[in-house]
């Protein structure tokens, strides 16, 4: 429980202003009324409070809003946002992109990835889906933040906004997120010509299934090795040596550099050594000639 002290009459706070920077922690606790603070939140960020003083102000707001802050307060948090935990943010309901922008700006340069991820999640929930305006805000103010959303949230992304997503926005996306985004991208770019389509779909290919990779191998796309290394292991394993060669084109030589790394290493283990030898790259670890490959998973599925 909080240790209660009485506010000295001469320290009574009638408005939130610069005089408060001279208040000790105990004086702020005793003299600043949370309801007054909330009503004058727009003044707080202009006052150079110490981190200790900001802690007190946060606790005051927590006292007033045990179920989470209303957006009228969140909008004006400013540097107080740096004091928020993901658990605090999870209680919020945020719909305004102005609020999102303001807090993304504050978080820049601070280690707040968990808080930002939770904030974006609350915005998506508050707005009902990740609409184009939200996506545009994220790409402008927080490149890479799109990938902080859970696959469940990303599932609400309409294909129409995929075109606004830049390759760098997907750099930190994991396989589960790309699994969700890839079908949307495929739908969004389906009417584009081969080369244009590949440029657009490339950042999303970490979510592509084997059959789509096989189809791409027939289109002379010359996939760079960085993209290949981000493909799903399960999608790459069934590809033949010839298909990988066609998929990578002149970049096939890069397989030698990556032969110890997944998915290249796992793919090599699945190929016949004599097929690998046709590449002339000296890749080792394939199935020796004369060995019979039994796919037990197929037999299990049949029984």
């Amino acid at each position: 429980d909080v240790e209660r002290t009485t506010c000295p009459p001469e320290k009574e706070v009638h408005e939130i202003d610069e005089s408060l920077i001279f208040y000790k922690k105990r004086e702020l606790e005793a003299c600043v009324d949370a309801a007054l603070l909330a009503a004058q939140m727009d003044r707080v960020d202009a006052i150079p409070f110490t981190y200790e003083q900001l802690d007190v102000l946060k606790h005051k707001l927590d006292e007033l809003y045990p179920q989470g802050y209303p957006e009228s307060v969140i909008r004006h948090l400013g540097h107080l946002f740096l004091k928020m935990s993901p658990e605090d943010i999870r209680k919020w309901n945020v719909t305004s992109l102005e609020t999102l922008k303001a807090l993304l700006k504050v978080s820049k340069g601070h280690e707040m990835s968990a808080q930002v991820a939770t904030l974006i999640d609350r915005v998506v929930v508050g707005r009902g889906q990740l609409d184009k305006d939200t996506a545009d805000t994220l790409t402008a103010f927080c490149p890479g933040c799109l990938c902080s959303l859970s696959p469940e949230r990303l599932s609400s992304v309409p294909p129409s906004i995929i075109g606004a997503v830049r390759p760098q926005d997907l750099d930190t996306c994991g396989p589960r997120q790309l699994d969700v985004l890839y079908p949307k991208a495929r739908l969004a770019f389906q009417n584009m010509s081969g080369s244009e389509y590949f440029v657009k779909i490339r950042p999303f290919l970490g979510g592509a299934p084997t059959e789509d990779l096989k189809a791409l191998s027939q289109q002379n796309v010359s996939m760079d090795l960085a993209t290949f290394m981000k493909l799903r292991r399960e999608a790459v394993l069934p590809l033949s040596v010839a298909e990988v060669q066609k998929l990578l084109g002149p970049h096939v030589e890069g397989l030698k550099v990556e032969e110890q790394h997944s998915p290249v290493r796992d793919w090599i283990l699945k190929q016949r050594q004599d097929d690998l030898d046709t590449l002339g790259l000296g890749l080792q670890g394939g199935i020796p000639n004369g060995y019979l490959i039994l796919d037990l998973s197929v037999r299990e599925a049949l029984s």
Epitope: D1, V2, R4, C7, H14, E15, E29, A30, C31, V32, D33, A34, A35, L36, A38, A39, Q40, H59, K60, E63, L64, Y65, P66, Q67, P70, S72
Partner: antibody
């Protein structure tokens, strides 16, 4: 169901003291701002005081500052108003009310207790 | 302190008529912090409108609030017999949290 029940009102002489109580139930008292509002006979409402739930930060109307003290006992879900140096103009029905920080206003009120200051 | 002035002092109207009550503040009040209450004789006040325009739980939609800055309005679109009462505005923008002096809506 939210309930606020005031008690402690009565007749008191000028200069005397009285302590009002307000028993709260049906909501999380320990998380809620509470207020006292009064109404003199035939007159309008006058905000008297409020108190925060955790830090017990207090605020008062100028007319009662230095004479009245608001307090709370969170373990008993009870709000108090200690009234000292009472004057004839303090005669009123005193209401205890719950402050809703989300729907900003006094959303639940007690039935009131009458304080009469007279010689 | 913020002084709230309500007008008119008394409004004499018939059931079914529209009532328009005014609340003027001596200095600007954030609309989030303006509330309206209804009080009937012998009863405690009841919160009608918060945030200048949002109806409190259980309040019929014939009650509506509007305004910003220093001028706020409570409107009752069609007066029902149970609406004849005294109405108060209150600001929570700064301390003390003052009330207006009230507007009595009486049957004509």
């Amino acid at each position: 169901e939210v309930q606020l029940l005031e008690s402690g009102g009565g007749l008191v002489q000028p200069g005397g003291s009285l302590r009002l109580s307000c028993a709260a139930s049906g909501f999380t008292f320990t998380q809620t701002y509470m207020s006292w509002v009064r109404q003199a006979p035939g007159k309008g409402l006058e905000w008297v005081s409020n108190i925060s739930p955790t830090y017990s930060t207090t605020n008062y109307a100028d007319s009662v500052k230095g004479r009245f003290t608001i307090s709370r006992d969170n373990s008993k879900n009870t709000l108090y108003l200690q009234m000292n140096s009472l004057r004839a103009e303090d005669t009123a029905v005193y209401y205890c009310a719950r402050y809703n920080a989300y729907q900003i206003g006094l959303d639940y009120w007690g039935q009131g207790t009458l304080v009469t200051v007279s010689s | 302190e913020i002084v709230l002035t309500q007008s008119p002092g008394t409004l004499s109207l018939s059931p079914g008529e529209r009532a328009t009550l005014s609340c003027r503040a001596s200095q600007s009040v954030s609309s989030s912090y303006l509330a309206w209450y209804q009080q009937k004789p012998g009863q405690a006040p009841r919160l009608l409108i918060y945030g200048a325009s949002s109806r409190a739980t259980g309040i019929p939609d014939r009650f509506s609030g509007s305004g910003s800055g220093t001028d706020f309005t409570l409107t009752i679109s069609r007066l029902e017999p149970e609406d004849f009462a005294v109405y108060y505005c209150q600001q929570h923008n700064q301390y003390p949290n003052t009330f207006g002096q009230g507007t009595k809506v009486e049957i004509k």
